[in-house]
């Protein structure tokens, strides 16, 4: 059964229940509800899910039963709107319930919160977690789905099922181990880091679809899949792009049952036709469903076919370029993107899209000119600076990273970005700059041919985090401009920003720079975040401070923390030495 050739079903809920099975059905409904109502207690969601599941079973038994013919949006929306505390907990989101479908679902989607006011997840002791796992495995795993889904309202639902499967496997194995902590903690750390990365990648896909439209997403997918499957025909890539677009449109739209079902169909299709797609799929296709889909999504690029012809002949030198373009613009541009991408696994997807956009703009102009061929003859020359810009940027930043190490490289970016957009909240600047700084460890170790796709496409994901967080409470016109003008030019737009000369420095507040003994018990990461928060605040107070001035203050601050954490009376040390440090810093920075 292809992704699009479904039989008509009397009951959509029965259809999905049968396709997915009870376990996945319940998990996906829980994820959907937790992503919509992010503040609701776990128990309330479980109750709603159980009610929906019981109803689905009645429809499986008799598809003609009352309400079984209703759409999933109607059924789920009606269920969400039964929550008693909707108005008190969610305020204006309760107004969604007065609307009819499809407006009601759109309303719920618009109220998803990328930065919900929820407590940080604190990891209990290993023995406590193992006891909870053994006491009630089902509830323990549901709680995991719930906590991740409500904090990441755009998490790719079928992929979250894969994470939950790994989470369960980690506890099953490690709770029996001699040293439970040594076994479990690294696995949980890995899942946490991979989960954050997965969430951020999916958030970019949803932003691409929702803010820039299906055409933008399809262009991204053509470029990426052509790099990954360079031996596949254009029509094969086009089919995969169409199906993948449907899957992500569904997940980003809250249609999680359809999304998971269609993703399974797509994995099945890819594996059945792997000979026509890629030689790298064999291992993936031997795995169970969730692992298979994940594996396919992460599969390495296939080898490029030998002897690919030059692109210039048909896309520049031919006299038929405008004729071919006019016949079917999007197909012609799609073929250009496909042919360029399959030849350039060494380019980032966003660079490939910039080249395609430049090519399109040139044809639009030249095909209306007196001598089109003369006009577009040099179009490939326009690509050179577009290619060199990210190459040079990555070279410079990798050199800086190798010189400074990750923490100090993050600090350099913190200063750089705070000066560019000082109006952005300090927690957002710290989070985004820390993530930007991780590009060094992630990508600079790669050979030249893999650096750009690693670095620039990762930066697109991180800058999208800045864009979605900023959209919730816009404070900077420059951020809004870079985020909304062009999806593929976001990174060059931010890179081109200079110091914001219009910014009025923040008033000095000694409280911001007052530290206590609790900093000594923090993990190294948390301590870094405290110091980086102080660094952002320093730059906001003194945006014209030089690197040398900031380095001196930060070095003094590190020495102060180290000294007081070794003192017998830590709190007194922080109080007294802190005052001295603030005074010295003010003097050093001329505050």
């Amino acid at each position: 059964r292809g992704v699009f050739r479904r039989d008509a079903h009397k009951s959509e809920v029965a259809h999905r229940f049968k396709d997915l099975g009870e376990e996945n059905f319940k998990a996906l409904v829980l994820i959907a509800f937790a992503q919509y109502l992010q503040q609701c207690p776990f128990e309330d969601h479980v109750k709603l899910v159980n009610e929906v599941t019981e109803f689905a079973k009645t429809c499986v038994a008799d598809e003609s039963a009352e309400n079984c013919d209703k759409s999933l949006h109607t059924l789920f929306g009606d269920k969400l709107c039964t929550v008693a505390t909707l108005r008190e907990t969610y305020g204006e989101m309760a107004d969604c319930c007065a609307k009819q479908e499809p407006e009601r679902n759109e309303c719920f989607l618009q109220h998803k919160d990328d930065n919900p006011n929820l407590p940080r997840l604190v990891r209990p002791e290993v023995d406590v977690m193992c006891t909870a796992f053994h006491d009630n495995e089902e509830t323990f795993l549901k709680k995991y789905l719930y906590e991740i889904a409500r904090r990441h309202p755009y998490f790719y639902a079928p992929e979250l099922l894969f994470f939950a499967k790994r989470y369960k496997a980690a506890f099953t194995e490690c709770c029996q181990a001699a040293d439970k902590a040594a076994c479990l903690l690294p696995k949980l750390d890995e899942l946490r880091d991979e989960g954050k990365a997965s969430s951020a990648k999916q958030r970019l896909k949803c932003a691409s679809l929702q803010k820039f439209g299906e055409r933008a997403f399809k262009a991204w997918a053509v470029a990426r899949l052509s790099q990954r499957f360079p031996k596949a025909e254009f029509a094969e890539v086009s089919k995969l792009v169409t199906d993948l677009t449907k899957v992500h449109t569904e997940c980003c739209h809250g249609d999680l049952l359809e999304c998971a079902d269609d993703r399974a169909d797509l994995a099945k299709y890819i594996c059945e036709n792997q000979d026509s797609i890629s030689s790298k799929l064999k291992e993936c296709c031997e795995k169970p469903l969730l692992e298979k889909s994940h594996c396919i999504a992460e599969v390495e690029n296939d080898e490029m076919p030998a002897d690919l012809p030059s692109l210039a002949a048909d896309f520049v030198e031919s006299k038929d370029v405008c004729k071919n373009y006019a016949e079917a613009k999007d197909v012609f541009l799609g073929m250009f993107l496909y042919e360029y991408a399959r030849r350039h696994p060494d380019y980032s997807v966003v660079l490939l899209l910039r080249l395609a956009k430049t090519y399109e703009t040139t044809l639009e102009k030249c095909c209306a000119a007196a001598d089109p061929h003369e006009c577009y003859a040099k179009v490939f020359d326009e690509f050179k600076p577009l290619v060199e810009e990210p190459q040079n940027l990555i070279k410079q930043n990798c050199e800086l990273f190798e010189q400074l190490g990750e923490y100090k490289f993050q600090n350099a970016l913190l200063v750089r970005y705070t000066k560019k957009v000082p109006q952005v909240s300090t927690p957002t600047l710290v989070e985004v700059s820390r993530n930007l700084g991780k590009v060094g460890s992630k990508c600079c170790k790669h050979p030249e041919a893999k650096r750009m796709p690693c670095a620039e496409d990762y930066l697109s994901v991180v800058l999208n985090q800045l864009c979605v967080l900023h959209e919730k409470t816009p404070v900077s016109d420059r951020v809004t401009k870079c985020c909304t003008e062009s999806l593929v030019n976001r990174r060059p737009c931010f890179s081109a920003l200079e110091v914001d000369e219009t910014y009025v420095p923040k008033e000095f507040n000694a409280e911001t720079f007052t530290f206590h003994a609790d900093i000594c018990t923090l993990s190294e990461k948390e301590r870094q975040i405290k110091k980086q928060t102080a660094l952002v605040e320093l730059v906001k107070h003194k945006p014209k401070a030089t690197k040398e001035q900031l380095k001196a203050v930060m070095d003094d601050f590190a020495a102060f923390v180290e000294k007081c954490c070794k003192a017998d009376d830590k709190e007194t040390c922080f109080a007294e030495e802190g005052k001295k440090l603030v005074a010295a810093s003010q003097a050093a920075l001329g505050l």
Epitope: E233, F234, A235, E236, S238, K239, N273, D275, S276, P305, L308, P309, L311, A313, D314, F315, K323, N324, E327, A328, V331, F332, G334, M335, F336, Y338, E339
Partner: nanobody, 125 residues
């Protein structure tokens, strides 16, 4: 709308060579993906090779890789198939086909919209 006419078939000994041609006329943009298919007696039609007339990319079925070469001459609206090291199992009626590059897949003849009448290739000693 689009007409395709094959030529060049015939009898050849194992190990020998043949060159098939296919002349296209009509709206040639509709033929910007072109391919060669073959059908042996009692067997299904199978894809042999395809080419995009824009971009020039080529695709081959595994059994002919390294032996057959597909090419095109856009100025003459002609498609070619150079067949070397021919084997008895290459005996079949060879068809020229064309369609849109957004649809045509070598493994699926139904994704090609236009077909020639076919030319017989017999490999026998």
């Amino acid at each position: 709308e689009v007409q395709l006419l094959e030529s060049g078939g015939g009898l050849v000994q194992p190990g020998g060579s043949l060159r098939l041609s296919c002349a296209a006329s009509g709206n040639t943009y509709l033929t910007s993906c072109m391919g060669w298919f073959r059908q042996a007696p009692g067997k299904e039609r199978e894809g042999v090779a395809s080419i995009y007339t824009v971009g020039g990319s080529t695709f081959y079925t595994n059994s002919v890789k390294g032996r057959f070469t597909i090419s095109r001459d856009n100025s003459k609206n002609t498609l070619y198939l150079q067949m070397n090291s021919l084997r008895a199992e290459d005996t079949a009626v060879y068809y020229c086909a064309a369609g849109s590059p957004a649809r045509c897949r070598l493994r699926d003849p139904t994704t090609f919209d236009y077909w020639g009448q076919g030319t017989l290739v017999t490999v026998s000693s």
